[in-house]
Interface confidence: low
């Protein structure tokens, strides 16, 4: 007689990351009997929702249902039907919705309300949609990468599961770059966190962690670009903006109304004698870098040390995982290798930005021009943010690891968020230790 495979005793969870530029749905899976173990949850699917972020639906909320359909249907296919009703679904919205809420709490609530109604129509166990704080975004990103790197397990492994993993239990810091905000989170070395807003205390698997975190709203790469354009157009003599952050020969028309649509450009807003202006790229890394630095106010600091804009930042400590747009941009520019020094990265950026737009379009024919045109700015912005904003140096650059996935799971806040909401990270070390981690690591 044929041996029948026993049904897998597994559980699933779904998290939607409603970011400023797009929404992604992640499906996680884990063995039911090992819920409290570290490192057992892994990502089985990512579905990128077609279209912009949910904050863009403010004037067309009736379309949110259709927008979410494809990915929610995909979840229905991936997760066995027998598991649907017990699979939790969480939606967390980040800085795009934080910005919308700053403009109008009522509009943000309306968008979330329609999102909730749409997600409630599916056979899963919908647990709610909410705007997570910048502090949560930083904290959950830190939990995700350290969980996936095995930093919370008490067993020290004699082998390494990822190239940049050290065998000690020192946690990695987390650097997250989105479209509208950026987060820095790490455990400082014996340093008091001088500003209470930036301090988090965790007890995970029997160990205490004092964590520093800050989320810089408006300093995600897309909002930083809007800020830079708004700042630079103030001093333009006419409706032509010669911009060093775009390739020579690149041209793009910008509506002034679009420029001032976001709260992030309010500080630069002025009455201009034109409704539109044209960006004309001149492709100069050094000038682009200088222009970006003007977005960081480093002239005042009420603490022993600051990042920028008067925000406390302790001395950097240990290794850092840089993910989300830090990774996507550097991956596109082929600069994620551990062997590439900061000087080399700067050199490559100088060459890249100086390349004519026509040449760039030919070299990267398959890439959407909207994205392609912004890699010079984004790469330069990443360097400026890490070096001048967070005070990494040429020496400490080697402690930054550009990470897309760890063990097949995306680095980002969503896994940490789900682990927390499903109570899968115990405060104390579980008493019964499973036979061997090696079977599911």
């Amino acid at each position: 007689t044929q041996n029948k495979a026993l049904p897998e005793n597994v559980k699933y969870g779904i998290v939607l990351d409603a970011g400023s530029s797009h929404t992604s749905l992640y499906i996680y899976k884990w063995p039911a009997e090992k819920e409290n173990d570290t490192g057992v949850v892994h990502q089985v699917e990512e579905c990128r929702v077609k279209g912009p972020g949910i904050s863009k639906f403010v004037q067309k909320v009736n379309e949110i249902g259709i927008y979410l359909t494809d990915c929610m249907e995909r979840a229905r296919e991936v997760i066995p039907r027998s598991q649907h009703q017990e699979t939790p679904v969480y939606l967390g919205a980040t800085a795009g919705m934080r910005l919308l809420r700053m403009e109008s709490e009522e509009l943000a609530d309306r968008v979330l309300d329609v999102v909730e109604r749409s997600l409630s129509n599916y056979p899963f166990d919908f647990q709610g949609a909410r705007i997570i704080t910048g502090q949560e975004e930083g904290a959950y990103g830190w939990i995700t990468i350290n969980y996936l790197l095995g930093k919370f397990s008490q067993k020290t492994r004699w082998f390494s599961i990822v190239p940049y993993e050290t065998n000690n239990q020192e946690t990695f810091g987390a650097l997250d770059l989105g479209g509208a905000s950026t987060q820095v989170t790490f455990v400082p070395q014996n340093q008091t966190i001088e500003s209470p807003d930036n301090a988090l205390q965790f007890r995970l698997y029997g160990k205490d962690y004092n964590v520093y975190t800050h989320s810089f709203l408006c300093y995600g790469k897309d909002q930083a670009l809007w800020q830079k354009l708004a700042k630079d157009i103030q001093v333009a003599s006419n409706e032509i903006l010669r911009d060093p952050c775009f390739h020579p020969g690149y041209k793009k028309v910008v509506n002034v109304s679009d420029l001032y649509k976001t709260p992030c450009t309010k500080r630069f807003e002025m009455t201009l004698p034109f409704q539109q202006f044209e960006i004309q790229g001149i492709g100069n890394y050094q000038q682009c870098h200088q222009s970006i630095l003007e977005l960081f106010n480093t002239s005042y600091c009420p603490y022993s040390q600051c990042a920028f804009n008067g925000i406390f930042l302790p001395p950097l400590q240990g290794d850092f995982g840089a993910f989300s747009a830090f990774y996507f941009v550097m991956k596109f520019l082929n600069l994620t290798s551990e062997k590439v020094s900061q000087e080399k990265v700067t050199e490559m950026m100088k060459k890249f930005c100086a390349q004519p737009w026509e040449e760039i379009k030919t070299s990267y024919a398959g890439v959407k021009e909207k994205y392609l045109s912004e890699y010079c700015f984004s790469g330069t912005y990443i360097l400026s943010l890490l070096l001048q904003g967070y005070h990494f140096t040429a020496d400490s650059w080697e402690h930054i690891h550009f990470i897309g996935k760890i063990q097949g799971s995306d680095a980002g806040w969503t896994l940490g968020y789900m682990l927390n909401l499903t109570n899968m990270i115990p405060a104390e070390q579980p008493l019964s230790t499973p036979l061997s981690h090696s079977t599911y690591v």
Epitope: K60, K251, K252, V253, E278, K368, E369, K370
Partner: nanobody, 135 residues
Framework: QLQLVESGGGLVQPGGSLRLSCAAS????????IAWFRQRPGKEREGVSC????????NYADSVKGRFTASRDNAKNTVYLQMNSLKPEDTAVYYC????????????????????????????WGQGTQVTVSS
Amino acid sequence: QLQLVESGGGLVQPGGSLRLSCAASGFTLDYYAIAWFRQRPGKEREGVSCISSSNGNINYADSVKGRFTASRDNAKNTVYLQMNSLKPEDTAVYYCAADLSAAPYNDAVRSCTGGSRLRATYDFWGQGTQVTVSS
């Protein structure tokens, strides 16, 4: 002065043909996604044909597939819509639109479906040209 100017509309019998042009001045069309839309009497404005900026891919609404052909002439800074086998239900004001949005990573829907979501991605419009198909 930045503008899009459509021309080529008019009265035509069912089964006939027309060629619409959309000329841009003040900016170069080849950098942008361009679409043809139409607004039929009493109906919402709908996408007819969408030309992607990155690879020149052209999408058509199901109702015009096989009958309408969009093209662009970058040297003349003009896009065209060749309309064959016209039907009375093609009667509408035809607009060309450019996606000039500086919104980074605002992933425009290029399939020429999506109603107002599609319309919202195009932020610069011509004044329109009337096409009437009648015997």
